[in-house]
Each structure stands twice: as structure tokens, then as C-alpha cells.
Amino acid sequence: MMTGTIETTGNISAEKGGSIILQCHLSSTTAQVTQVNWEQQDQLLAICNADLGWHISPSFKDRVAPGPGLGLTLQSLTVNDTGEYFCIYHTYPDGTYTGRIFLEVLESSVAEHGARFQIP
């Protein structure tokens, strides 16, 4: 039976050009974590394998850094990074646990003007 739960950083709102850390934590289980995948929509960003360490997808190498821990650091954020991110914990013997984090990246002008929407 899968007893574990995933806690995440929570959803994040950030500014264009900045950086953020996405983190998940698996608790309430004694299962062994064999691998953690980080994905956005259907794209694989990075893998942290218990034996082989980190692998960052080539298309994200410039802007994605491993860690801290099993987390992932996204740098030089763009509006295109707005979206849902998944931490997928592969464990033995439990199986797979998934956490979801939504990242909102705001244009700096949007952030400065608050909730008053800007006419283009």
C-alpha cells in the first residue's frame, strides 16, 4: 500500500529574469527513492538517479541547475516558463509518487503595476 505523501514548495509567482527553486519532499513512507524526474508538461527537465546522479536535459542545460537536494533551480525565467511542473518520485517498493507545482512568471511591468492590467 502506498502510504507516502509529497509536500511541495507550493505554487510560485516570480518575475521574468529571476530564478526560483522547485522542491518536493516525500514523507510518511519507508520506501527507497530510486529516481526523481522533473518534468514540465510533457518535457523532461532533469533526472536525479540514486546511483547515477543528475542528468539535465540538453535543451535546459543553460537554465536549469540541480539541487538543492532533490530539488531543481530554474534560472533566467521567461514568460514561456509559466506552467505546471511535476516531481515524479520512483520508489521501491511503493511505486510512483507525483507532486505538482504551478509556476507563474510575470513580466516585470506586470509585477510593478500590480493587479491593474496593462493595455498593450
Epitope: V79, T82, G83, I101
Partner: antibody, heavy 118, light 112 residues
Framework: EVQLQQSGPELVKPGASMKISCKAS????????MNWVKQSHGKNLEWIGL????????SYNQKFKGKATLTVDKSSSTAYMELLSLTSEDSAVYYC???????????WGQGTTLTVSS | DVVVTQTPLSLPVSFGDQVSISCRSS???????????LSWYLHKPGQSPQLLIY???NRFSGVPDRFSGSGSGTDFTLKISTIKPEDLGMYYC?????????FGAGTKLELK
């Protein structure tokens, strides 16, 4: 002036699908996520999901995955929600709402009433 | 999913009253950066919901200062200092910190 103009009321038969449109004007369409909200029985509000008009990326409430499909047409600043395999449980008022995490759902469409009945 | 509990469900008032609506979440709404995405909405009959407060305590553009928001962690409050006729309707809180976003069940502000 910011406006979200939704398509009109719909009466559809069980098992059918339908698409609601939400045309945005008065602000930068790609700068804010577009959210969709269901109101059943004139009371409960439920978040269906959102779409990032900039890149078409979506995030769904798992409850509505397979029921709702969100898309956008950037050229016309219009967001769409298609509802599939309709049942009486889908009869509700559906709203589009522009905004996001930090600033809330700042602007709302007028709502589209969907009635599913044979 | 994060459960958002709103109390009371019904609030009978007289014009000029000061009232408070409570919103409690099943887990903390502060993310790892200390930001809390909690907003309040008023839904009047025959209209669309309207944003009153975002980020716990920030009044949206054009919202009168008789509306104020406060709270942290799991407990949040919307205060209306002097009830006016246009304030009657359903009030909802919305948490945006955890997926999926969830609304409270609503508080109906109605005349005594």
C-alpha cells in the same frame, strides 16, 4: 477597459460535446493566465484549470481532466474550453477569469450557462 | 487537495454593521518563499464574481477601504467595516498556493 466576452447559453444533449469561447480585450492577453471556473446549483465554485496564452501550457484540476480541454487562439485573443461527453452533472454556469496566483482572478467573463438535457 | 473551510455559511446583517468572514485551510498557504496566494471575491446575483482582495490583504483597484483582509498560515479573515446595500451577496475565498486551486464554500451576506 478590460473585458472578457463569453459565448451565449447552450442547451445540449447528453453525450454531446460543446465549446465555450472567451474573447479578451483591453489588456495584454499573453501576460496573464486564463482560468476557468464552474458554478453548480448557483453556489459552489470549482476551479477547472488554466491555460497560459503565451505558450498554450495548461494546468488542470484532476477532477476535470478528460472532461475539459483548454485552448487559446492568440491571433484573436480568445480562450476556449471544450467540455466532452456531457451529462446532467455538467449543467452549470462556466466562467473564464483572467489573472493569476499573485493578483487573483482580476477579471471575469459574464458566464455561460450550459444545460444538458435530453 | 487543500480543503478551504469558510465560516459562517450565512451571515444576517443590518446596514452599518461590521462583520468578519473566516477562511481556514487544511494546510499552510505560505509557499517556500513565504508568499501566500489567498484572495477574496464577492458574487452578487445575476453578476460575475468580482475580486476584492488578493495576497491576503491587498485591495483590488476600485475596492472601497471598508473591505480589509488579514491572516497568515491557515487562518484568514475578511472584514467589512460598514455594511452597505451593494455589499450583499456571496463571499468566497480562493487559495492559489497548492494544486488544484480551491474555493471556500461561500458565505451568504443577507439582510436580517
Amino acid at each position: 477597459e478590460v473585458q472578457l466576452q463569453q459565448s451565449g447559453p447552450e442547451l445540449v444533449k447528453p453525450g454531446a460535446s460543446m465549446k465555450i469561447s472567451c474573447k479578451a480585450s483591453g489588456y495584454s492577453f499573453t501576460g496573464y493566465t486564463m482560468n476557468w471556473v464552474k458554478q453548480s446549483h448557483g453556489k459552489n465554485l470549482e476551479w477547472i484549470g488554466l491555460i497560459n496564452p503565451y505558450n498554450g501550457g495548461t494546468s488542470y484540476n484532476q477532477k476535470f481532466k478528460g472532461k475539459a480541454t483548454l485552448t487559446v487562439d492568440k491571433s484573436s485573443s480568445t480562450a476556449y474550453m471544450e467540455l466532452l461527453s456531457l451529462t446532467s452533472e455538467d449543467s452549470a454556469v462556466y466562467y473564464c477569469a483572467s489573472g493569476g496566483l499573485r493578483y487573483g482572478f482580476a477579471y471575469w467573463g459574464q458566464g455561460t450557462t450550459l444545460t444538458v438535457s435530453s | 487537495d487543500v480543503v478551504v473551510t469558510q465560516t459562517p455559511l450565512s451571515l444576517p446583517v443590518s446596514f452599518g454593521d461590521q462583520v468578519s468572514i473566516s477562511c481556514r485551510s487544511s494546510q499552510s498557504l505560505a509557499n517556500s518563499y513565504g508568499n501566500t496566494y489567498l484572495s477574496w471575491y464577492l458574487h452578487k446575483p445575476g453578476q460575475s464574481p468580482q475580486l476584492l482582495i488578493y495576497g491576503i490583504s491587498n485591495r483590488f483597484s476600485g475596492v472601497p477601504d471598508r473591505f480589509s483582509g488579514s491572516g497568515s498560515g491557515t487562518d484568514f479573515t475578511l472584514k467589512i467595516s460598514t455594511i452597505k446595500p451593494e455589499d450583499l451577496g456571496m463571499y468566497y475565498c480562493l487559495q492559489g498556493t497548492h494544486q488544484p486551486l480551491t474555493f471556500g464554500a461561500g458565505t451568504k451576506l443577507e439582510l436580517k
